[in-house]
Amino acid sequence: GELETSDVVTVVLGQDAKLPCFYRGDSGEQVGQVAWARVDAGEGAQELALLHSKYGLHVSPAYEGRVEQPPPPRNPLDGSVLLRNAVQADEGEYECRVSTFPAGSFQARLRLRVLVPPLPSLNPGPALEEGQGLTLAASCTAEGSPAPSVTWDTEVKGTTSSRSFKHSRSAAVTSEFHLVPSRSMNGQPLTCVVSHPGLLQDQRITHILHVSFLAEASVRGLEDQNLWHIGREGAMLKCLSEGQPPPSYNWTRLDGPLPSGVRVDGDTLGFPPLTTEHSGIYVCHVSNEFSSRDSQVTVDVLDPQEDSGKQVDLVSAS
């Protein structure tokens, strides 16, 4: 006869490990007992369990409540045991020693591998600001056994660097993603991808990039000066900028206070029916936590009467 077992049994932390040991005997052969022991190098054999054909299952006090025989029906030649709720400390070498009649004793060894799936964590780097050089965007750390793989999935251009720390029964892997911040990266996803044999599928943690910036300010509304004439209704100036965080807007008049009736609504300055009083230099002040910008425009309100008088004069003069 011969013993059938596995070289390696792999389980995920917390799962039950089946340690196989089957005696493939000739007809008439019987298994008297199967002794299971842990036999890590440099240490003596430590009893796990004894399966006896008459006395039944004896479990070592160290494994009390954790070792069972597989559920019935059971083959009398099957010396397999179940190790319940595998923990990292269970990883190691195990030996089954089978006493048979009349063939004698046989033994086989297997290695129990306990996979410890990682619980990854993503830590964003310092605040990203346009104009910075190469900056840490985020770091991702995952610890497991064996060492997990940590990679990045993103459309953003950047560089990665990884380091690994070995512990007694596991390894921690940290990967960093560096980039040169630009406004085009704002709102872009940066995803840490962790792969491990103990995971059914990759674990993904997504971080949305926030790059602080403030665009140059400009004012719209004066494209056609001829529209800015006395009596015109609905005239407005709009301050154009963009930024992260979203900027706030403030309007002032350089050559005095804002005329009465002029309405400030965020980035928009709304005018009542125009008068010559509304002529002047207007300043749009844009700011966020990152920076501030100014843009100024000169408003010159035309008097149609003056224009038409001149025209008449010109006509009459001709």
Epitope: A35, A37, E47, K54, Y55, G56, H58, S60, P61
Partner: antibody, heavy 123, light 107 residues
Framework: EVQLVESGGGLVQPGGSLRLSCAAS????????MSWVRQAPGKGLEWVSG????????HYADSVKGRFTISRDNSKNTLYLQMNSLRAEDTAVYYC????????????????WGQGTLVTVSS | DIQMTQSPSSLSASVGDRVTITCRAS??????LAWYQQKPGKAPKLLIY???SLQSGVPSRFSGSGSGTDFTLTISSLQPEDFATYYC?????????FGQGTKVEIK
């Protein structure tokens, strides 16, 4: 024929010492775990101590730990129990018994017993 | 330590009677249980090992059953030579422990 014969019992004063012997024959003594079991007058059986085959690895009942020492001489097929600091409650018939080691510290039932030797601790 | 509780502590029966003695372990011991018979002034004699296996030379009227924590010794038809004290013993752990005994007396 398997035989276990105890000797060395007798009357001893409290605090005294006694050495019991158990001569084995009719089987491969060195292959068996051996133990001492006692029975106080009119009482039940109480396991006292046990020793593994091929070694001096021993176990003791809490009631005798530190006072009794079990040993074996495989060349003489003899089991011993050295009893020190004896107390009145140690008064009993002492039996030696054999059991087969299955594996680790797991034994079969004790299939053969000696006839016993009486130890009386009294002043 | 594992406690072994035997019942009854004594019983009176007649020749030919069926006698049952029970033994309960304080925790599971698989089938690591033996039954011994002891007569006055004699050494204990192994009757049943592994809870239900009859020791060589023991009459077949003796039988054992059970596994885990509850065990039974049955004498199917009591004979005159069976009047004695019976002990159960677990040898699952060290120290091995005995029940307190059941004395079977003539009615």
């Amino acid at each position: 024929e398997v035989q276990l014969v105890e000797s060395g019992g007798g009357l001893v004063q409290p605090g005294g010492s006694l050495r019991l012997s158990c001569a084995a024959s009719g089987f491969n003594f060195y292959n068996y775990g051996m133990s001492w079991v006692r029975q106080a007058p009119g009482k039940g059986l109480e396991w006292v101590s046990g020793i593994k085959p091929h070694s001096d690895v021993a176990h003791y009942a809490d009631s005798v730990k530190g006072r009794f020492t079990i040993s074996r001489d495989n060349s003489k097929n003899t089991l011993y129990l050295q009893m020190n600091s004896l107390r009145a409650e140690d008064t009993a018939v002492y039996y030696c018994a054999r059991a087969e080691l299955l594996a680790f510290d797991v034994y079969t039932a004790s299939d053969y017993w000696g006839q016993g030797t009486l130890v009386t601790v009294s002043s | 330590d594992i406690q072994m509780t035997q019942s009854p502590s004594s019983l009176s029966a007649s020749v030919g009677d069926r006698v049952t003695i029970t033994c309960r372990a304080s925790q599971g011991i698989s089938s690591y249980l033996a039954w011994y018979q002891q007569k006055p002034g004699k050494a204990p004699k192994l009757l049943i090992y592994a809870a239900s296996s009859l020791q060589s030379g023991v009459p077949s009227r003796f039988s054992g059953s059970g596994s885990g924590t509850d065990f039974t010794l049955t004498i199917s038809s009591l004979q005159p030579e069976d009047f004695a004290t019976y002990y159960c013993q677990q040898h699952y752990t060290t120290p091995p422990t005995f029940g307190q005994g059941t004395k079977v007396e003539i009615k």
